[in-house]
């Protein structure tokens, strides 16, 4: 069926970057400026996305691909394809309806985006707090009692199966 259709439909021969122009006997015409077609056989070209205001151009539009936007400094992308820009805050803060606010005591945020999260409760794992938390950093839990016992092994444990929560700085 597909093969038959392609023989019958001259538009299927129009490559990406062109459109099948009904006004010109279905000739493949190049996409006009500021438009693109990312697949073949298109009957129209799509208007290029314009990165304006708080958005800035990460990748220019071409005849075969849309422009890509990111956010100006002080903002970060949200949503698929960076559909929105949200204001950055400092580490140790979170964005509220009233702007950036410091994390409450007992919570932290080690990024410029997102919300303040509670410090880890070390006692849930049978550990104690070794380094206190701050607005910017989680606590550090000490080793487990088994790690400190006289018979403790010095062998490095296997890598944890769960993804670590923080990246180095």
């Amino acid at each position: 069926f597909e093969r038959t259709r392609s023989l019958q439909d001259p538009c299927s021969n129009c490559p990406a970057g062109t459109f099948c122009d009904n006004n010109r006997n279905q000739i493949c015409s190049p996409c006009p400026p500021n438009s693109f077609s990312s697949a073949g056989g298109q009957r129209t070209c799509d208007i290029c996305r314009q990165c304006k205001g708080v958005f800035r151009t990460r990748k220019e539009c071409s005849s075969t691909s849309n422009a890509e936007c990111d956010c100006t400094p002080g903002f970060h992308c949200l949503g698929a394809g960076c559909s929105m820009c949200e204001q950055d805050c400092k580490q140790g803060q979170e964005l509220t309806k009233k702007g950036c606010k410091d994390c409450c005591f007992g919570t932290f945020n080690d990024q410029k985006r997102g919300i303040c999260r509670p410090w880890t409760n070390c006692s849930l794992d049978g550990k104690s707090v070794l380094v206190n938390g701050t607005k910017e950093r989680d606590v550090v839990c000490g080793p487990s009692p088994a790690d400190l016992s006289p018979g403790a092994s010095s062998v490095t444990p296997p890598a944890p199966a769960r993804e670590p929560g923080h990246s180095p700085q």
Partner: nanobody, 117 residues
Amino acid sequence: QVQLQESGGGLVEAGGSLRLSCAASGSIFSINVMGWYRQAPGKQRELVAVITSDYSTNYADSVKGRFTISRDNAKNTVYLQMNSLKPEDTAVYHCAATGYGSSPWYWGQGTQVTVSS
């Protein structure tokens, strides 16, 4: 895996100094905290000092004012400068590393420090 390699241990007279080094290698992307624990024969491993990637420190009371921990983040290395050593500082000194929160701890094989009176 995280590998920790210590160096700098040895025999020293009371009142003397030593500098321990520990280099981390391997999967160190989650390592934000490095430090030293020590273990005397038949005793529990105990904290000496730890330092975070943003240079917060914590020392055992018994070494405050005598020992100084520092780190070189670019080299993934932590140092322990030990001054005014006492016989009771004699132990195997283990390098240790972990992340923030309740992350797993990684341990070096240890380096022997012996302080003679």
